[in-house]
């Protein structure tokens, strides 16, 4: 058992049929010695008397807010939450597995550049009686500071019969060094409490592995005289790290016909322009990726050929 | 070349070769189904590799002030990885495929380190740790980890040379 916050305790339970559970001793926070009674949640049923109450916590019915009273006056409370371990694995019932980039991905994180700023998000189908806390650091044995802002509801989607809620949080490394080669990963820890269930989720990554640039900006076409060719030009996204001579991007230019079945022409270039053949009803798209490290490609920026 | 007098390297040549190194490092070990090698308790193996750290002067400002600190750090790393790629971690079982890019990668690491330091002038190099895994599966895991670490190292080196070629070339 350990304290999550003042008067709120997490009981770690091996969860299997007929498990013995955990013995928990609650102590009433009072100088009083006599006439103390204990109740659970809104019930008035007396569970025991005396300054301490010993309970065997086996299931969710044993968790909740225990209150000690004397003569109708509330003396103190303790809230017990359960953290389930099944077959040696902590439960992950509250958040949804996003399955990207691999199974058991509950937290996903992305960075638009090397500034040490990143965003993480998670999904749940639970709407009410749900709270989170978020912590982050660089490294775990001698952690360096990362400051996270508020975790807010960033999207609501309907998935079949279910509503899905997306929460996201922005974090910033306190002493970021964009040009350095990371040797210690960023750790992100999210704990979730739903009703009386406690769970925690972690993600560990290097910023370089979660880089996803914004799409190129100011995508423009310039027809070349007496030719079906056009010169496509674009610029680095505003959010990308500077100087661009150091933090360079590479680009993929794609000509795509109206029909998805049509063959796509693709050109890769380190420049911010390219010459391509513009087919009727086609569109030209450009996306960006770090030039020297194969992290994610940006989303496409597109313009119609006409 | 970064000769003893501390003059500039051939930035453009270094840029081309370091960019080639990036390509080779990724073709030697593409993202294998996003295999997360940090889960495999790699502290004792890849924490010993030289990293380009914040105080090494490899940022744009540091390069402008005095590129020698950074170039020395890069040189150290190149020699370190060149030795690792030539060690029994990569030469032992399981054998690399004949067309593996590791051979080219090894040669390019050597090539870039020589561009940075001609014969007759010696920068201090870092001792390579005695990593001799006994099991082929351990060797395979170690290869993956070394290549992942090398990808990060050569990315920083390539940025340094690209910036140098664009802003510091005579």
């Amino acid at each position: 058992i350990w304290e999550l916050k003042k008067d709120v305790y997490v009981v770690e339970l091996d969860w299997y049929p007929d498990a013995p559970g955990e013995m928990v001793v609650l102590t009433c926070d009072t100088p009083e010695e006599d006439g103390i009674t204990w109740t659970l949640d809104q019930s008035s049923e007396v569970l025991g008397s005396g300054k301490t109450l010993t309970i065997q916590v086996k299931e969710f019915g044993d968790a909740g807010q225990y209150t000690c009273h004397k003569g109708g006056e509330v003396l103190s409370h303790s809230l017990l939450l359960l953290h389930k371990k099944e077959d040696g694995i902590w439960s992950t019932d509250i958040l949804k597995d996003q399955k990207e980039p691999k199974n058991k991905t509950f937290l996903r994180c992305e960075a638009k550049n090397y500034s040490g700023r990143f965003t993480c998000w998670w999904l749940t189908t639970i709407s009410t009686d749900l709270t989170f806390s978020v912590k982050s650091s660089r490294g775990s044995s001698d952690p360096q500071g990362v400051t996270c802002g508020a975790a807010t509801l960033s999207a609501e989607r309907v998935r079949g019969d279910n509503k899905e809620y997306e929460y996201s949080v922005e974090c910033q490394e306190d002493s970021a060094c964009p040009a350095a080669e990371e040797s210690l990963p960023i750790e992100v820890m999210v704990d979730a409490v739903h009703k009386l269930k406690y769970e925690n989720y972690t993600s560990s990554f290097f910023i370089r592995d979660i880089i996803k640039p914004d799409p190129p900006k100011n995508l423009q076409l310039k027809p070349l005289k007496n030719s079906r060719q056009v010169e496509v030009s674009w610029e680095y996204p505003d959010t990308w790290s500077t100087p661009h001579s150091y933090f360079s991007l590479t680009f993929c230019v794609q000509v795509q016909g109206k029909s998805k079945r049509e063959k796509k022409d693709r050109v890769f270039t380190d420049k911010t322009s390219a010459t391509v053949i513009c087919r009727k009803n086609a569109s030209i798209s450009v996306r960006a990726q770090d030039r020297y490290y194969s992290s994610s490609w940006s989303e496409w920026a597109s313009v119609p050929c006409s | 070349r970064a000769v003893p007098g501390g003059s500039s390297p051939a930035w453009t040549q270094c840029q081309q070769l370091s960019q080639k190194l990036c390509t080779l490092a990724w073709s030697a070990h593409p993202l294998v189904g996003h295999m997360d090698l940090r889960e495999e308790g790699d502290e004792e193996t890849t924490n010993d590799v030289p990293h380009i750290q914040c105080g090494d002067g490899c940022d744009p400002q540091g390069l402008r002030d005095n590129s020698q600190f950074c170039l020395q750090r890069i040189h150290q790393g190149l020699i370190f990885y060149e030795k690792l790629l030539g060690s029994d971690i990569f030469t032992g079982e399981p054998s690399l495929l004949p067309d593996s890019p590791v051979g080219q990668l090894h040669a390019s690491l050597l090539g870039l380190s020589q561009l940075l330091q001609p014969e007759g002038h010696h920068w201090e190099t870092q001792q390579i740790p005695s990593l001799s895994p006994s099991q082929p599966w351990q060797r395979l895991l170690l290869r993956f980890k070394i290549l992942r670490s090398l990808q990060a190292f050569v990315a920083v080196a390539a940025r340094v040379f690209a910036h140098g070629a664009a802003t510091l070339s005579p």
Partner: nanobody, 125 residues
Framework: EVQLVESGGGLVQAGGSLRLSCAAS????????MGWFRQASGKKREFVAS????????SYADSVKGRFTISRDNAKNTVYLQMNSLKPEDTAVYYC?????FGSGSYYDLMYDYWGQGTQVTVSS
């Protein structure tokens, strides 16, 4: 120093309405859920309603569902409780609470970190 100040309580006849306000100062509660609890004399403090930061997710105790509405104005750092069709059993001291955690809130008062002094609501029959 964080302060939550409730207002709007008073004496009302059964079937009447009241609107409670809770003004927060000392910090913004971005991302943090807020809630209302009440305590009738001689009873335990009980959950009434909670609301997430966006105002999109609300939750109510069964005893007040359909009669009470919780809302918030983040620009004013204020949360409201509109109470309609009041009954004598709604008589209690009403407390505003804010959590330092994120999400939609909790039914348990110990999951909240900041509390107001309370405002008395008395419903006469």
């Amino acid at each position: 120093e964080v302060q939550l100040v409730e207002s709007g309580g008073g004496l009302v006849q059964a079937g009447g309405s009241l609107r409670l306000s809770c003004a927060a100062s000392g910090r913004t509660f971005e991302g943090n859920p807020m809630g209302w609890f009440r305590q009738a004399s001689g009873k335990k403090r009980e959950f009434v309603a909670s609301i997430d930061w966006s105002g999109g997710i609300t939750s109510y105790a069964d005893s007040v569902k359909g009669r009470f509405t919780i809302s918030r104005d983040n620009a004013k750092n204020t949360v409201y409780l509109q109470m309609n069709s009041l009954k004598p059993e709604d008589t209690a001291v009403y407390y505003c609470a804010a959590s330092a955690r994120f999400g939609s809130g909790s039914y348990y008062d110990l999951m909240y970190d900041y509390w107001g002094q309370g405002t008395q609501v008395t419903v006469s029959s």
